[in-house]
């Protein structure tokens, strides 16, 4: 969470940003809020990126002004224009690229004053894991798959019954490059599993941490997955 203050004459406004992460190939949002101003025509929003000449995006008098927009962002940006008067200056970014990572500045000017705040935007790939029982294996095993990760993550297994156990000797993890030659598919197999136990497959890089849980009993298989972005907020 970054809060910036700006001074314009005697007036300053608070601008707040949140460190956020973009999933490459998908749409992303760079969060920025400011003190609301009921006069839309008096609000100017500028997004800038460190090391880039020109603007990422500019919104003023209720409309986008893309005359100074850098070409790498052409056709890829928007604000939530409906929500600007209530203080939402967040930037929407289409088809996030690795090269979109960096330090951004959200600059706001309203009839109340002006202010800005920086935001660190990380880019990578992250996806939910899915765990299935691998009946083809000679012994009962679990297969944890997640389709898109970058940078290469670490994978660890845990179990409810054998808490603290090291499963690296009884698991095998592989990373397969996807067709776009950036992201990778993660596959990890855990061998010699026992029924009536809950196993967790944890995949983590510096952007996100994902966990898939599976509980196998004689009568049913229960699954649960969750994904958490790291260092956000």
């Amino acid at each position: 969470l970054i809060i910036g203050f700006g001074i314009s004459g005697k007036h300053f406004i608070t601008v707040t940003t949140f460190t956020s992460a973009g999933n490459i190939g998908e749409d992303g949002t760079l969060s920025c809020t400011f003190e609301p101003d009921i006069k839309l025509n008096g609000i100017v929003i500028q997004w800038l990126k460190e090391g880039i000449k020109g603007l990422v995006h500019e919104f003023k008098e209720g409309k986008d002004d893309l005359s100074q927009q850098h070409e790498m962002f052409r056709g890829r940006t928007a604000v939530f224009a409906d929500q600007v008067v209530v203080g939402n200056a967040s930037l929407r970014l289409k088809n996030v690229q690795l090269t979109d990572a960096g330090t951004y500045t959200c600059y706001i000017r309203t009839s109340k004053g002006k202010g800005n705040a920086n935001l660190e935007y990380k880019t990578g790939a992250f996806s939910m894991p899915e765990i299935n029982v691998d009946y083809n294996a000679s012994s009962e095993s679990l297969r944890c798959e997640a389709p898109r990760w970058f940078p290469q993550p670490t994978v660890a297994w845990a179990s409810q019954v054998d808490q603290g156990a090291n499963f690296s000797e009884v698991s095998n993890t592989s990373f397969e490059l996807n067709s776009e030659n950036v992201t990778m598919k993660v596959v990890s197999v855990l061998y010699n599993v026992t029924i009536n136990n809950t196993y967790s497959c944890m995949i983590e890089n510096d952007i996100a941490k994902a966990t898939g849980d599976i509980k196998v009993t004689d009568s049913e298989v229960k699954r649960r997955s969750q994904l958490q972005l790291l260092n956000s907020g």
């Epitope: 209720g62 928007a78 224009a81 209530v86």
Partner: antibody
Framework: QVQLVQSGAEVKKPGASVKVSCKAS????????MHWVRQAPGQRLEWMGY????????SYNQKFKGRVTITVDTSSSTAYMELSSLRSEDTAVYYC????????WGQGTLVTVSS | DIQMTQSPSSLSASVGDRVTITCKAS??????LSWYQQKPGKAPKTLIY???SLADGVPSRFSGSGSGTDFTLTISSLQPEDFATYYC?????????FGGGTKVEIK
């Protein structure tokens, strides 16, 4: 200036579908949600749903129980509203509209459902 | 669904009068309320959104106030072109719902 221009009046038979278009100009199409509202003769306005042109996301009034589909073509800055399984009570003027930002609505498209 | 109760349903006023129209939501909608003007045979026009923000190109004699459940549209000095029907809309919760309208007529 900002303009929303809708397609012309339609006469349809019960059970048919109608697709109304709304061409936007004068602003960046992907910045504002596009809403669809209808007004039956002598009735209050009724919200049907909206589309987020940035990503095609939609929200619908469940009253229409899957009969309404709102889409966009960003290359032509056009929004579409399709209403299927038409009945006589769907006879109304259909509008594309902004809830925030700009005053303008589309001029309206009269859809008459009659056997 | 959230019910929007608009009052009065009609009123008579003279040019130059200050006119107030109210809208009451059946539950808290924060500031998610818009006001619209419609003239006979014409498309509605957005006047106010988020309870207090004036839409682009709308004269400053129109203003909105309120939050939560009670909202007001005020026309500070009624002009001949303001005789029309006015609607409120809550956009805090789907489905968005309109009030029944207030017809402003010439006295």
């Amino acid at each position: 200036q900002v303009q929303l221009v809708q397609s012309g009046a339609e006469v349809k038979k019960p059970g048919a579908s109608v697709k109304v278009s709304c061409k936007a100009s004068g602003y960046t199409f992907t910045s504002y949600y596009m809403h669809w509202v209808r007004q039956a003769p002598g009735q209050r306005l009724e919200w049907m749903g909206y589309v987020d042109p940035f990503n095609g996301g939609t929200s619908y009034n469940q009253k229409f129980k899957g009969r309404v589909t709102i889409t966009v073509d960003t290359s032509s800055s056009t929004a579409y509203m399709e209403l299927s399984s038409l009945r006589s009570e769907d006879t109304a003027v259909y509008y594309c509209a902004f809830i925030a930002g700009f005053a303008n609505w589309g001029q309206g498209t009269l859809v008459t459902v009659s056997s | 669904d959230i019910q929007m109760t608009q009052s009065p349903s009609s009123l008579s006023a003279s040019v130059g009068d200050r006119v107030t129209i109210t809208c009451k939501a059946s539950q808290d909608i924060k500031s998610y309320l818009s006001w619209y003007q419609q003239k006979p045979g014409k498309a509605p026009k957005t006047l106010i959104y988020y309870a207090t923000s004036l839409a682009d190109g709308v004269p400053s004699r129109f203003s909105g106030s309120g939050s939560g459940t009670d909202f007001t549209l005020t026309i500070s000095s009624l002009q001949p072109e303001d005789f029309a029907t006015y609607y409120c809309l809550q956009h805090g919760e789907s489905p968005y719902t309109f009030g029944g309208g207030t017809k402003v007529e010439i006295k």
